[in-house]
């Protein structure tokens, strides 16, 4: 992937739109939308003023760890859906799109240098462990997905892209 493709806001917006669509189709869906287990996902909240004071490398650590955990969670959701007796087709479609989207975003972040940045800061090892929450429905899973994209990921790429412009 071109190194700074993710710096084009339209790219992230495309994935965000997909995530919001997925969240919307699960609104009010009970019958097909339970995960039947608790899946660990990243907490999409941040300590606002601490985040603002963070080095971009520390932000990269949080985003990279969060993206990895979110990818695992969506893959687990996909596996549970495949194993269910009658997977609901619209849900299947959006889970597959989310898996594909997270793979692409991982590639785009790697191209931006997020992985390298996440490893390089001297305080990366002492960074606080990633805060997590659990999701027991596809609605919660997709909400975390869309909140992660429009939250930490957008904040980090904005900062990383700005830093790269200097």
């Amino acid at each position: 992937a071109p190194p700074r493709l993710i710096c084009d806001s339209r790219v992230l917006e495309r994935y965000l739109l997909e995530a919001k669509e997925a969240e919307n189709i699960t609104t009010g869906c009970a019958e097909h939308c339970s995960l039947n287990e608790n899946i660990t996902v990243p907490d999409t909240k941040v300590n606002f003023y601490a985040w603002k004071r963070m080095e971009v490398g520390q932000q990269a650590v949080e985003v990279w760890q969060g993206l990895a955990l979110l990818s695992e969670a969506v893959l687990r959701g996909q596996a549970l859906l495949v194993n269910s007796s009658q997977p609901w087709e619209p849900l299947q479609l959006h889970v597959d799109k989310a898996v594909s989207g997270l793979r692409s975003l991982t590639t785009l972040l790697r191209a931006l240098g997020a992985q390298k940045e996440a490893i390089s800061p001297p305080d990366a090892a002492s960074a606080a462990p990633l805060r997590t929450i659990t999701a027991d429905t596809f609605r919660k899973l997709f909400r975390v997905y869309s909140n992660f994209l429009r939250g930490k990921l957008k904040l980090y790429t904005g900062e990383a892209c700005r830093t790269g412009d200097r």
Partner: antibody, heavy 127, light 108 residues
């Protein structure tokens, strides 16, 4: 339940210093997620944010540009309170002054909001 | 500095729906918070992050935000809803909160 109790004089002479205190109960001024603010309200300027203090491994202050040269917000950890000092006041500084807590542990796509407020103190600047 | 524009007053009959607007350049891309202030009292947060309600705030209070306008909607208006309402956003250029001028809601 967080409560903020304000104290301080209601009348200040021009060119003098306005001093107010906000005592916190139900939370800590050294909280690692909240920020502690002063906001004022007057008929001519509406609600106007003045500044904040917060602790994230060390103390930080942010001030509104228009008052930056004459404002100090100080935390007092021993009394679990924070104070406002506004120097060289003029009649334009006449307003109701509020202290307020800003919740800072929020969704990453959001911005902090004021979830608890003091009762307000009307401060009149007049000789 | 980012400017928020609110109508000075809105009137509504009890049981009807009140809509209070807050205008700002591309406000839809920002998070909007709403406060209610009754005479002689401090403001109270009624909606945050465009549409979320703090605990204790009735479901009658809801919010939306897109384009250049954010809206606070109060359904089944009661006499006790009569107050001033303020919107608030974050001015990212100066890293500080900005308030709208306020809207006086009158229940007829």
């Amino acid at each position: 339940q967080v409560q903020l109790q304000q104290s301080g004089p209601g009348l200040v002479k021009p060119s003098q210093t306005l001093s107010l205190t906000c005592a916190i109960s139900g939370d800590s001024v050294s909280s690692n997620s909240a920020a502690w603010n002063w906001i004022r309200q007057s008929p001519s300027r509406g609600l106007e944010w003045l500044g904040r203090t917060y602790y994230r491994s060390k103390w930080y202050n942010d001030y509104e540009v228009s008052v930056k040269s004459r404002i100090i917000i100080n935390p007092d950890t021993s009394k679990n309170q924070f104070s406002l000092q506004l120097n060289s006041v003029t009649p334009e500084d006449t307003a109701v002054y509020y202290c307020a807590r800003e919740e800072g542990y929020i969704e990453a796509h959001s911005v902090p909001y004021f979830d608890y407020w003091g009762q307000g103190t009307l401060v009149t600047v007049s000789s | 500095s980012y400017v928020l524009t609110q109508p000075p007053s809105v009137s509504v009959a009890p049981g009807q729906t009140a809509r209070i607007t807050c205008g700002g350049n591309n406000i839809g891309s920002k998070s909007v918070h709403w406060y209610q202030q009754k005479p002689g009292q401090a403001p109270v947060l009624v909606v945050y992050d465009d549409s979320d309600r703090p605990s204790g705030i009735p479901e009658r209070f809801s919010g939306s935000n897109s384009g250049n306008t954010a809206t606070l909607t109060i359904s089944w208006v009661e006499a006790g809803d009569e107050a001033d309402y303020y919107c608030q956003v974050w001015d990212s250029s100066g890293d500080h909160p900005v308030f709208g001028g306020g809207t006086k809601l009158t229940v007829l």
